[in-house]
């Protein structure tokens, strides 16, 4: 008599997560009498997937009626496949006995599950950095299978090249994760810039998944300071202006000091935005020259986004002050330089 064969025609089957998988198995003979069982994996640790005679297998149904006389088709259908169902499935024939004895196994069918990657999540640096500095952005996506995946970074219409990408785990797994880090050199114009992380995978086909991060969350643009004196007024008052320009974010405190003493403190709020996303702010201080016997040292002190204060100082010479001043004089454009105004 011919030896019984257990035939699993497909070496591998690939199914999308959520779909049903059909695992085919036929036997070449009805003899000897005994049941067929399905297992995932081989050896002592194998997992029973389906046994017609006993057990509860809610996601597994036989393809043909196993109670039918002369049935030789023991194919099964597993519904609502998840990545955890991946593995090699064996159709195994047993000889009836007490207990049943394993007689022959099919060659096995490897079930791989195609699962979509999760939407990429992009995270930026914890603290802001200034122009010319390099900051890192990280992009993560999880739960995809198979392992092959493409990840690209973009900024302002260009693909980024300073990128390091890892797919984990390195070995075989039911699903995989990708983590990529892109290093970006900031410029003063980056307040409105965006970085985009794009993930392409076989399951996505027509459209990739993208995650974005705004560089406005990562950048600090420190202000330029300029202090100017407007012309002397008839009432011996001098109007001094502190222009704070091209800064981001808006969080800024300005303090006027007269001879080292705090004269006034202001907080920037509801400023109009420049085209490049930065802000400008102008503060005025009226100094009554006739109320001073000696020269007045004026300081405009700016604290931006929790950074150390930046000062611009100059002296108003009281001694030889003419009644009408026709000049428009600026303080030197460096930290604590003083400028004498006559």
């Amino acid at each position: 008599e011919e030896e019984l064969q257990v035939i699993q025609p497909e070496k591998s089957v690939s199914v999308a997560a959520g779909d049903s998988a059909t695992l085919n198995c036929t036997v070449s003979s009805l003899i000897p009498v005994g049941p067929i069982q399905w297992f995932r994996g081989a050896g002592p640790g194998r997992e029973l997937i389906y046994n017609l005679k006993e057990g509860h297998f809610p996601r597994v149904t036989p393809v043909s009626d196993p109670t039918k006389r002369n049935n030789m088709d023991f194919s099964i259908r597993i519904s609502n496949i998840t990545p955890a169902d991946a593995g090699t499935y064996y159709c195994v024939k047993f000889r009836k006995g007490s207990p049943d004895v394993e007689l022959k196994s099919g060659a096995g069918t490897e079930l791989s599950v195609r699962a979509k990657p999760s939407a990429p999540v992009v995270s930026g640096p914890a603290v802001r950095a200034t122009a010319e500095h390099t900051v890192s952005f990280t992009c993560e996506s999880h739960g995809f299978s198979p392992r092959d995946i493409t990840l690209k970074w973009f900024k302002n219409g260009n693909e980024l090249s300073d990128v390091q990408t890892n797919v984990d785990p390195a070995g075989k797994s039911v699903s995989y994760s990708i983590r990529s880090t892109a290093r970006v050199v900031l410029t003063r114009r980056d307040v409105h810039s965006q970085v985009i992380c794009e993930v392409a995978h076989v399951t996505l086909q027509g459209d990739p998944l993208r995650g974005t991060a705004n560089l406005s969350e990562a950048i600090r643009v420190p202000p330029f300071l300029e202090v100017t004196q407007q012309s002397m007024r008839a009432d011996n008052q001098v109007n001094v202006t502190c222009q704070v320009t091209k800064f981001y974010p808006q969080r800024l405190q300005l303090t006027w000091l007269e001879n080292g003493n705090v004269s006034r403190t202001e907080m920037a709020s509801a400023l109009p935005e420049n085209k490049d996303g930065t802000y400008n702010w102008t503060s005025w201080l009226l100094v009554n020259v006739s109320a001073h016997r000696d020269d007045v040292k004026l300081t405009c002190q700016v604290e931006h986004d929790g950074q150390p204060a930046v000062n611009k100082s100059f002296s108003v010479k009281v001694s030889a002050h003419p009644k009408e001043q026709g000049s428009n004089t600026a303080a030197e454009n460096t930290g604590t330089n003083e400028r004498n105004i006559y």
Partner: antibody, heavy 120, light 107 residues
């Protein structure tokens, strides 16, 4: 070699249904998206949407939501475009086109086109 | 939706001419731009993808350039078989959108 072969021309009366087929060969059908493009007589190309051949999901451009449907017969490597309740303005040539792979989602191979004329 | 604008709907050219066809996107499309050639009665044929990559079998007289929102298709020396309508198409976002087309005609 890769080929997309579409069904022949159709003449329909307003209100009828038309179904166009696009048979793919030379590649694994379920690995690539299938797009549909409309070209009215003397006009330019208009993207209608695409079908994910693996998951069966359909994406339709705004102008093609409602009466238009994309179908698949995966076992026959065939994609279908069905237009219900056809109108005169549906008179056009319809193309199927394969979506590229990886991050190059360009339409790289096209069917020869199917002419649909709607006339009472 | 991203609008694609081909400024010239038709061009009258002489054989051997250098031809430049422009295409402008309403927003950044990150080089996800394709150029197609369509001859009367035929399906479109992909010439260039990724704004600059020439497809296999496309003559080297064709080239693509550009970035951001502005892209160009160039033909260095026009041949008889190049007489056709050329379409640009963005595939950065859905819906995919085509330019209106530029028809090349011989003077």
């Amino acid at each position: 070699q890769i080929q997309l072969v579409q069904s022949g021309p159709e003449l329909k009366k307003p209100g009828e249904t038309v179904k166009i087929s696009c048979k793919a060969s030379g590649y694994t059908f379920t690995d690539y998206a299938m797009h549909w493009v409309k070209q009215a007589p003397g006009k330019g190309l208009k993207w209608m949407g695409w079908k994910n051949t693996e998951t069966g999901e359909s994406t339709y451009a705004e102008d093609f939501k409602g009466r238009f449907a994309f179908f698949l017969e995966t076992s026959a490597s065939t994609a279908y475009l069905q237009i219900n309740n056809v109108k005169n303005e549906d008179t056009a040539t319809y193309f199927c086109a394969r979506g590229g792979y990886g991050s190059n989602y360009v339409m790289d191979y096209w069917g020869q086109g199917t002419s649909v004329i709607v006339s009472s | 939706d991203i609008q694609m604008t081909q400024s010239s709907s038709s061009f009258s050219v002489s054989l051997g001419d250098r031809v430049t066809i422009t295409c402008k996107a309403s927003e950044d499309i990150y080089n996800r731009l394709a150029w197609y050639q369509q001859k009367p009665g035929n399906a479109p044929r992909l010439l260039i993808s990724g704004a600059t990559s020439l497809e296999t079998g496309v003559p080297s007289r064709f080239s693509g350039s550009g970035s951001g929102k502005d892209y160009t298709l160039s033909i260095t020396s026009l041949q008889t078989e190049d007489v056709a309508t050329y379409y640009c198409q963005q595939y950065w976002n859905s819906p995919r959108t085509f330019g209106g087309g530029t028809k090349l005609e011989i003077k």
